[in-house]
Interface confidence: low
């Protein structure tokens, strides 16, 4: 074992910890339990005790973050660096940070809690064997009612233990229908829907009606997410695998690596890949939050990396189901704190507490208990009116959509969002975008389909901006943000991950404000935003009219173009230029005629 120079350690034995935020990969109760069990490993062999507190003056602050997350030691995206922790001491010392670009699990695939069945709410076991075949996600095979299920042991054929996976056919969350399951098909704004939809919402949440006619009954719920089959990357990030799906004429009931040379598992997100070409990567085994946390907490207590490959403090991740602490770890921690004074207790149980399950019968009605994993800032109202039809069908590339009068940017009254990307102006409206280059004497190019260039995005965007230094593109819609770097996407993430409170319903624009800093706007308010840390400074909140006198207070989009700020209201813009720290409106005009140079006919 090794300790940090000077044998850094805590000088009190009652250590406190604060879980500052959560990953969305695991239910909160599972995360709480993983951290508690990780601390218990160390308290079992030392005089230390660990108490969870709810304030930032805790000794050990636990945080999930991505990339540059505020401490000067950025994470590196998926894989590679999983987490880091600081040795004992005040302030950031002792804190443990976990890379939220990883898939956090308990080391054996995504954690999917089940309901009903005969497994008392145990989590799915992936992969599992059913009728001789291996499944890496919940399946509807063997059932005629369309309910997804999984085995809770490695082999259903021998063990016969199963539960039902989260499914809108089983229950919905929040909404106003007491958790009743979706009713398919249902009518919304005169259209028939046979699956959950985001139509009518600007926040990207999937919902359904719980009666046959939403227009009449106004009863709805939100569709549960399915971590086991929510794809990453590809051109359908965030969508669900559809099983079975057809690929090259063959049917697949589970993720496959067919067609790829790198062995990575993927699935289609529609029933026919051959015709629809929609796909994404399947979740992998993930990293055990328990094991990684136990390692990081070792650092937070004063242990540096060990050179013993079997030790928990060895610098390489290795999944194990055996006791994680090696004699070398125990010797190291006791070198710092001494042994536990009383006889060592039995090792902590490694099973996660499960909610009591309903009777072990096939469900006939929805459970009444609401899940605890619902995002706290999740939607609570009925869907607001929005687009009335399904997204425009189109090829899966950035081909120009055939032009009709409605597709001419010059005929668009109000754009959803406008942004300068590279040296072109991008104009977004209802699933489409146009590109415009000033001074070429040409009209805006397009429309192109947003889904072709940025497949993870919803049709309706509130604002977009490009951070010039890092070339990151931020897309805001409702209470969510997507961040694209080249072809890879992070998100959707909730606005609270950026430090914006639940009272901020949307981000309506952004302006540059110095190196790596932006101003984010929402209605009449604005905040200073650090792009590297991806955090607003809550103390920077200000009123728009104090900083930009003379602009309308109900702007729906704010963007920067040619180093000037544009505040849009209806079809008009107010242009603001900054001279000697003074922001002054120097022009008011039409977006179409004065920026896009459309003919005034």
């Amino acid at each position: 074992f090794q300790t940090f120079e000077g044998d850094l350690k805590w000088h009190h034995h009652n250590i406190t910890y604060w879980i500052q935020n959560y990953s969305e990969d695991l239910p909160r109760a599972v995360i709480d339990d993983a951290f508690a069990r990780a601390f218990a490993l160390w308290s079992a062999v030392t005089p230390l005790t660990f108490t969870r507190v709810y304030s930032r003056d805790a000794d050990i602050v636990i945080q999930f973050g991505v990339a540059e997350h505020g401490d000067g030691y950025p994470f590196d995206g998926k894989d590679g660096l999983l987490a880091h922790a600081f040795p004992p001491g005040p302030g950031i010392q002792g804190d443990a940070h976990f890379d939220d670009d990883e898939l956090w699990s308990l080391g054996k695939g995504v954690v999917v809690p089940t309901r009903f069945g005969n497994a008392d709410g145990a989590a799915c076991h992936f992969p599992f064997i059913f009728e001789g075949r291996s499944y890496s996600a919940c399946t509807t095979d063997g059932r005629s009612d369309g309910l997804p299920w999984c085995s809770t042991t490695a082999n259903y054929d021998t063990d016969d233990r199963f539960g039902f996976c989260p499914s809108e056919r089983l229950y919905t969350q929040d909404g106003n229908a007491d958790g009743k399951p979706c009713q398919f098909p249902f009518i919304f704004q005169g259209q028939s829907y046979s699956a959950c939809t985001t139509d009518g919402r600007s926040d990207g949440y999937r919902w359904c009606a719980t009666t046959a006619n939403y227009d009449r009954d106004k009863l709805f719920g939100f569709c549960p997410t399915r971590a086991d089959s929510t794809v990453m990357g590809g051109n359908s990030a965030g969508e669900l695998c559809v099983f079975p799906f057809t690929f090259l004429g063959k049917e697949y009931s589970t993720c496959t690596s067919e067609g790829r040379g790198d062995g990575r598992l993927w699935c289609a997100t529609t029933s026919n890949f051959d015709s629809d070409k929609k796909w994404g990567f399947c979740p992998d085994q993930g990293y055990s939050l328990f094991l990684v946390a136990a390692h990081e907490f070792g650092h937070a207590l004063g242990l540096d990396h060990s050179s013993v490959p079997e030790a928990l403090m060895y610098p390489m991740y290795r999944f194990t189901e055996g006791p994680p602490l090696h004699k070398d770890d125990v010797n190291g921690i006791r070198h710092l704190y001494g042994p536990r004074p009383e006889p060592e207790p039995r090792p902590p149980t490694t099973t996660t507490p499960q909610p009591t399950a309903p009777p072990t019968v096939c469900p006939t009605g929805p459970p009444t208990v609401h899940p605890s994993e619902r995002p706290t800032a999740g939607p609570t109202g009925p869907p607001s009116a929005g687009p009335t039809g399904p997204p425009t069908a189109g090829p899966s590339t950035a081909t120009t959509v055939p032009l009709s009068p409605v597709d001419d940017a010059c005929n668009v009254n109000i754009f959803d969002a406008i942004a300068e990307i590279g040296n072109q102006l991008y104009l977004f409206k209802d699933g489409k975008y146009w590109r415009f280059s000033e001074g070429r004497g040409s009209r805006p190019q397009g429309p192109f389909l947003i889904a072709d260039k940025w497949p993870a995005l919803p049709r309706k965007l509130d604002s977009v901006f490009e951070e010039r230094l890092s070339k990151k593109l931020f897309f805001f819609s409702g209470r969510q943000v997507w961040v694209y770097t080249g072809a890879s996407v992070l998100g959707p993430r909730r606005l609270d991950k950026l430090g914006l409170g639940a009272d901020v319903a949307q981000v309506t624009g952004a302006l540059r404000s110095g190196r790596g800093k932006m101003l984010l706007f929402s209605g009449r308010r604005l905040w200073r935003f650090d792009v590297k840390a991806q955090m607003v400074d809550p103390r920077s909140a200000s009123e728009v009219d104090r900083m930009f006198p003379g602009v309308p207070l109900d702007t729906h989009d704010v963007f920067q173009y040619r180093e000037k700020a544009y505040f849009c209201q209806d079809r008009f813009y107010w242009r603001v230029s900054s001279r000697s720290e003074l922001n002054q409106v120097d022009q008011v005009g039409y977006v179409t005629y004065d920026i896009l140079q459309c003919p005034e006919d």
Epitope: G234, T397, D452, S470, A487
Partner: antibody, heavy 116, light 108 residues
Framework: QVQLVESGAEVKKPGASVKVSCKAS????????ISWVRQAPGQGLEWMGW????????NYAQKLQGRVTMTTDTSTNTAHMELRSLRSDDTAVYYC?????????WGQGTTVTVSS | QAVLTQPPSTSGTPGQRVTISCSGS????????VNWYQQLPGTAPKLLIY???HRPSGVPDRFSGSNSWNTATLTISRVEVGDEGDYYC?????????FGGGTKVTVL
């Protein structure tokens, strides 16, 4: 004008390492990424990886993972690419290229010959 | 072996129209935009088309690009003797950059 100037040709033995440098001028170095691309004699282009000159983030080709390291020095506006455990099939012209929506500015290329 | 497939060679007489195809899969061309590079003999590659169909300044409008489904196409509307060289397509595939094998254009 915008240009990338690469270091001179190298002759290396199998198992050795090579470090190629690429000095940028005429633009704000930290506003772009740098991609490294190589071309074996008579062959096509092969992407090796990318580095952000802004924050040092890297993305390496799977095939070279573990053998290649890309770095930038913002004080001299220079990007470096080190390739270790050289083999004869690493003989190629190595290009650096400014990368934004495409690789729009290329270095002149550095010939690396690996021979015993 | 290149992930994107291009014909090894094509030819045309001056003034003729020359097209080069670049086919891939939904994992690359099908979900991302395509760039094209020109490499004249003994020189470094040069960006010819970016984001499927956009020409950097200085590239003649004889060069155009398109991308439909899993195939991108580079068109030289009126080929000239000075266009002789190798042409490469490039796209993203997951989080990696992939090139086509290259097409040698000969002007007869």
């Amino acid at each position: 004008q915008v240009q990338l100037v690469e270091s001179g040709a190298e002759v290396k033995k199998p198992g050795a390492s090579v470090k190629v440098s690429c000095k940028a001028s005429g633009y704000t170095f930290t506003s772009y990424g740098i991609s490294w691309v190589r071309q074996a004699p008579g062959q096509g282009l092969e992407w090796m990886g990318w580095i952000s000159a802004y924050n040092g983030n890297t993305n390496y080709a799977q095939k070279l993972q573990g053998r290649v390291t890309m770095t930038t020095d913002t004080s001299t506006n220079t990007a470096h690419m080190e390739l270790r455990s050289l083999r004869s099939d690493d003989t190629a012209v190595y290009y650096c290229a400014r990368d934004y929506y495409g690789m729009d500015v290329w270095g002149q290329g550095t010939t690396v010959t690996v021979s015993s | 072996q290149a992930v994107l497939t291009q014909p090894p060679s094509t030819s045309g007489t001056p003034g003729q129209r020359v097209t080069i195809s670049c086919s891939g899969s939904t994992f690359n061309i099908g979900s991302n935009t395509v760039n094209w590079y020109q490499q004249l003999p003994g020189t470094a590659p040069k960006l010819l088309i970016y984001s499927d169909s956009h020409r950097p300044s200085g590239v003649p409008d004889r060069f155009s690009g398109s991308n439909s489904w899993n195939t991108a196409t580079l068109t030289i509307s009126r080929v000239e003797v000075g266009d002789e060289g190798d042409y490469y397509c490039q796209a993203w595939d997951s989080s990696a950059v992939v090139f086509g094998g290259g097409t040698k254009v000969t002007v007869l």
